[in-house]
């Protein structure tokens, strides 16, 4: 015959542990039910009655199966210079991220401790790896036959147009100029953009500073600033 299924609360066998989604109550000395995410323990179990759970109140949450007497408070509302990417619900805390065009350079458990502007690749360099909510843009030099003439955190290197007769050869920061009225093949007009990370979707006008130095990349290093990435702009 199969072993009988024990219903909570029950006394565990000596040396055994409680099952998944149960906890051992020291006072009752019984295995008791945990409360589901979004709930908390309103009344702890006894030898004869199981845990009584109740829903979290507004602006509080529990993310895990638990037996806490009170739900955790959601973090304060996102400030005007942050974006709420996850709302406060009964099952999850609010998460605030950096504003568009910025990334989190030093994170904390819920949200960000220090935001920094996304690096911009200067002409002659394109985006090798786009920025995300928690990582900066990586720039790379445009390979022979490609160019970028923009200062941008999204533009990649584009192929030079192919001319019947070349008036001015293209280089890393300029497209080829053809003598004939139309090239044999050309890219569609406008820069090629990489997909934006969540935090930069509604991109507002961003700085296009001149010097080829980057915002310091040392935020997560134990020492001072490291040399800037080649082909980027910033401070």
């Amino acid at each position: 015959l199969p072993a009988q299924v024990a219903f909570t609360p029950y006394a565990p066998e000596p040396g055994s542990t409680c099952r998944l989604r149960e906890y051992y109550d020291q006072t009752a000395q019984m295995c008791c039910s945990k409360c589901s995410p979004g709930q908390h323990a309103k009344v702890f179990c006894t030898k004869t009655s199981d845990t009584v759970c109740d829903s979290c109140e507004d602006s509080t949450y529990t993310q895990l199966w638990n037996w806490v007497p009170e739900c955790l408070s959601c973090g304060s509302r996102c400030s005007s210079d942050q974006v709420e990417t996850q709302a406060c619900t009964r099952e999850q805390n609010r998460i605030c991220t950096c504003r568009p065009g910025w990334y989190c350079a030093l994170s904390k458990q819920e949200g960000c401790r220090l935001c920094a502007p996304l690096r911009k690749c200067r002409p002659g360099f394109g985006v090798a790896r786009p920025g995300t909510e928690t990582s900066d843009v990586v720039c790379k030099p445009c390979a022979p036959g490609t160019f970028s003439n923009t200062t941008s955190s999204t533009d990649i290197c584009r192929p030079h147009q192919i001319c019947n007769v070349v008036a001015i050869p293209g280089n890393a920061s300029m497209d080829a100029v053809c003598t004939s009225t139309s090239p044999t093949r050309s890219m569609a007009p406008g820069a090629v953009h990489l997909p934006q990370p969540v935090s930069t979707r509604s991109q507002h006008t961003q700085p296009t500073p001149e010097p080829s130095t980057a915002p310091s990349t040392s935020f997560l290093l134990p020492m001072g600033p490291s040399p800037p990435a080649e082909g980027s702009t910033g401070d």
Partner: antibody, heavy 119, light 107 residues
Framework: QVQLVQSGAEVKKPGASVKVSCKAS????????IHWVRQAPGQGLEWMGW????????NYNEKFKDRVTMTRDTSISTAYMELSRLRSDDTAVYYC????????????WGQGTTVTVSS | DIQMTQSPSSLSASVGDRVTITCKAS??????VAWYQQKPGKAPKLLIY???TRHTGVPSRFSGSGSGTDFTLTISSLQPEDFATYYC?????????FGQGTKLEIK
């Protein structure tokens, strides 16, 4: 309420080092970045660098990185800024400051520590 | 480094006057500019951040505007307690730099 209380005035000789302290209260010390800013007599403000007490992350202004060391003692919620090889032009008021959110504008400042470098 | 150039360096005005201080960044800093007020022997006090957002408790007579490289702080009607030195600061990227200050004096 948040308070940053700094150590008292110091007089040092050229070539010496000075260590300024900044005791934090009214918030969890390991949750906020501490910055150091200095102001020479009659001059503007100059950012020296930041230090995150929660994990020892540091970002020094290139101008000071060979001479400045920022440390902390979490047991007493205190941050320190040590400046070595002092010169007369290091005579200034040194401030610790912090920012509430993730962007670097300073909403809390220490009262300042005057450091005089004179032979 | 991004330089912040303030003008004028000093300014005489009377109570009730409207005063404008300008700050020019050497590079585009978007709208990441803050303004501080400092009185002799005291630490600076944050007035405005993100160009135009007033810090908690700052009177509505203080306002800021601008974007890119040109920024202004305006005090619409000077009060006796407003005579102080004002600094702009970009909070765009390291190293964070300040303007050299504008000293506002009583005429």
């Amino acid at each position: 309420q948040v308070q940053l209380v700094q150590s008292g005035a110091e007089v040092k000789k050229p070539g010496a080092s000075v260590k300024v302290s900044c005791k934090a209260s009214g918030y969890t010390f390991t949750e906020s970045i501490i910055h150091w800013v200095r102001q020479a007599p009659g001059q503007g403000l100059e950012w020296m660098g930041w230090f995150y007490p929660g994990s020892d992350n540091i970002n020094y202004n290139e101008k000071f990185k060979d001479r400045v060391t920022m440390t902390r003692d979490t047991s007493i919620s205190t941050a320190y800024m040590e400046l070595s090889r002092l010169r007369s032009d290091d005579t200034a008021v040194y401030y610790c400051a912090r920012h509430e959110g993730p962007y670097v504008y300073f909403d809390y400042w220490g009262q300042g520590t005057t450091v005089t470098v004179s032979s | 480094d991004i330089q912040m150039t303030q003008s004028p360096s000093s300014l005489s005005a009377s109570v009730g006057d409207r005063v404008t201080i300008t700050c020019k960044a050497s590079q585009d800093v978007s709208t990441a500019v803050a303004w501080y007020q400092q009185k002799p022997g005291k630490a600076p006090k944050l007035l405005i951040y993100w160009t135009s957002t007033r810090h908690t408790g700052v009177p509505s007579r203080f306002s800021g505007s601008g974007s890119g490289t040109d920024f202004t702080l305006t005090i619409s009607s000077l009060q006796p307690e407003d005579f102080a030195t004002y600094y702009c600061q970009h909070h765009y990227s390291t190293p964070y730099t300040f303007g050299q200050g504008t000293k506002l004096e009583i005429k």
